[in-house]
């Protein structure tokens, strides 16, 4: 297991919510991504492929999420001070082998200006 701080902007604030960006290498074909708050699993997304190369995407702990070819974004809404915590992206790589787990994270600071929905011009 590889642990570390995210070397990219992990938190993107908008309209009283936050997009938490969990990146993975482009070469990764099949994986599970979990979003942890402290040690608790908040959200997860699993991408696998069958023998006909058909993609299956599953969530056991569902959050609004968005998948791209090198990241999973999890969205948290209605931010309040209780959201301030360490968040971790727990990536389990199934394919290509070997199986590997990486953990990257950062601290989500909540400021007053991020709590209310702001108009964007």
């Amino acid at each position: 297991e590889i642990n570390g701080s995210a070397n990219y902007e992990m938190f993107i604030f908008h309209n009283g919510g936050v997009q938490i960006l969990c990146k993975y290498p482009d070469i990764v074909q099949q994986f599970k991504m979990q979003l942890l708050k402290g040690g608790q699993i908040l959200c997860d997304l699993t991408k696998t492929k069958g023998s006909g190369n058909t993609v299956s995407i599953k969530s056991l702990k569902f959050c609004h999420s968005q998948l791209s070819n090198n990241s999973v974004s999890f969205f948290l809404y209605n931010l309040d001070h209780s959201h301030a915590n360490y968040y971790f992206c727990n990536l389990s790589i199934f394919d290509p082998p070997p199986f590997k787990v990486t953990l990257t994270g950062g601290y989500l600071h909540i400021y007053e200006s991020q709590l209310c929905c702001q108009l964007k011009f």
Partner: antibody, heavy 117, light 111 residues
Framework: EVQLVESGGGLVKPGGSLKLSCAAS????????MDWVRQAPGKGLEWVGN????????EYSPFVKGRFTISRDNVKNTLYLQMNSVKSEDTATYYC??????????WGQGTLVTVSS | DIVMTQSPSSLAVSAGDRVTINCKSS??????????LTWYQQKTGQAPKLLIF???TRHTGVPDRFMGSGSGTDFTLTINSFQTEDLGDYYC?????????FGPGTKLELR
């Protein structure tokens, strides 16, 4: 240790039905796509179809589509193949296989289905 | 559907031989940096076993005398220093798209 054990094979008349089962153990069944592959006596391997982890996606060979149905029970750790309107060309050993992300990495011992009047 | 062909269909071999089995697909199996091609071994009366995936990666526990190579549409399985326990049928298989298909097989027999 991964184990797949097929059952339910036997003699069936053309146009008849048969249901095969595959009991899985030694791994988290609900984490894997599963497939059926068949082999006619003295012939090569032929893919029958597959099912994703929770049963929401199924795919079939054009040779069996509309006649065969694959399902699974993740509580019982069992894979099924419902064979309807069988033909003589369906005579084969049917293997239950685990799709291990990039290949069929575990196979059952197979169960023989004979279609004959 | 992608058609897989294999040559030769059968081959007589002796212990210590270097054995080469060829597999050709009707369209490229390369996607990104991966060739979606696997090789299986089937001994008489047994279920098949996975040998090679992604054209060249040996599956866990497979002896290093088995080597896969090739890219695109042309692939090769090589057995360096054939052993008698390697007797059986060998199948290539693609999982580039649905339906995945197998080659017709190559039978290795003792000379």
């Amino acid at each position: 240790e991964v184990q797949l054990v097929e059952s339910g094979g036997g003699l069936v008349k053309p146009g008849g039905s048969l249901k095969l089962s595959c009991a899985a153990s030694g791994f988290t069944f609900s984490d894997y796509w599963m497939d059926w592959v068949r082999q006619a006596p003295g012939k090569g391997l032929e893919w029958v179809g597959n099912i994703d982890e929770d049963g929401s996606i199924t795919e079939y060979s054009p040779f069996v589509k509309g006649r065969f149905t694959i399902s699974r029970d993740n509580v019982k750790n069992t894979l099924y193949l419902q064979m309807n309107s069988v033909k003589s060309e369906d005579t084969a050993t049917y293997y239950c296989t685990r799709w291990g992300r990039f290949g069929f990495d575990s196979w059952g011992q197979g169960t023989l289905v004979t279609v004959s009047s | 559907d992608i058609v897989m062909t294999q040559s030769p269909s059968s081959l007589a071999v002796s212990a210590g031989d270097r054995v080469t089995i060829n597999c050709k697909s009707s369209q490229s199996l390369l996607s990104g940096s991966f060739n979606y091609l696997t090789w299986y071994q089937q001994k008489t009366g047994q279920a098949p076993k996975l040998l090679i995936f992604y054209a060249s990666t040996r599956h866990t526990g497979v002896p290093d005398r088995f080597m896969g190579s090739g890219s695109g549409t042309d692939f090769t399985l090589t057995i360096n220093s054939f052993q008698t326990e390697d007797l059986g049928d060998y199948y290539c298989h693609h999982h580039y798209n649905a339906p995945p298909t197998f080659g017709p097989g190559t039978k290795l027999e003792l000379r």
